[in-house]
């Protein structure tokens, strides 16, 4: 599987609003949501037979043509 964009950097934004214990603050939608799956299962380690998708927290080159770094508004992330 081809590598997707994962070079994300945070931007200045208001502090996350407090969530009830059963919820987590989603850094993209900026709302409290059900925490759901805790840490998506890691792809196979390097050296596996087929290239696995990487996760958002792993460094990667920019995907956009001419873009220095792909950016998503993720306050507090990275």
């Amino acid at each position: 599987m081809r590598r997707g964009p994962r070079s994300l950097r945070g931007r200045d934004a208001p502090a996350p609003t407090p969530c009830v214990p059963a919820e987590c603050f989603d850094l993209l939608v900026r709302h409290c949501v059900a925490c759901g799956l805790l840490r998506t299962p890691r792809p196979k380690p390097a050296g596996a037979s087929s290239p696995a998708p990487r996760t958002a927290l792993q460094p990667q080159e920019s995907v956009g043509a001419g873009a220095g770094e792909a950016a998503l508004p993720l306050p507090g992330l990275l």
Partner: nanobody, 121 residues
């Protein structure tokens, strides 16, 4: 192995519709929130929509609100994005992305390979 495979992209005229599909495998899809995130040519990433594991919570970016509809079928491990009234500015690579949570926060997890949508007359 976690796998997300998007399909349904293509070239479409402004005002028309497309439906994107994301086939998920290798993890418990039914308990994972999911995002659609896009990247226009030469631009940064833009969050499009979010759906919770049970479809009870749905959010849209302002730029697509009222035009795009996110949905999922947990029995088929599939995520969808129905895109109506498409505009030239919707031209982008669309990625299906898992939601990962920890330490009281959620954020993008694993990304698919993307499917390209081109809106052009």
């Amino acid at each position: 192995e976690v796998q997300l495979v998007e399909s349904g992209g293509g070239v479409v005229q402004p005002g028309r519709s497309l439906r994107l599909t994301c086939a998920a495998s290798g993890f418990t899809f039914s308990t994972s929130g999911m995002y659609w995130i896009r990247q226009a040519p030469g631009k940064g990433l833009e969050w499009v929509s979010y759906i919770s594991s049970s479809s009870s919570t749905i959010y849209y970016a302002d730029s697509v609100k009222g035009r795009f509809t996110i949905s999922r079928d947990n029995s088929k491990n599939t995520l969808y994005l129905q895109m109506n009234s498409l505009r030239a500015e919707d031209t982008a690579v669309y990625y299906c992305v898992t939601q990962s949570c920890g330490a009281g926060k959620c954020y993008p997890g694993v990304w698919g390979q993307g499917t390209t949508v081109t809106v052009s007359s």
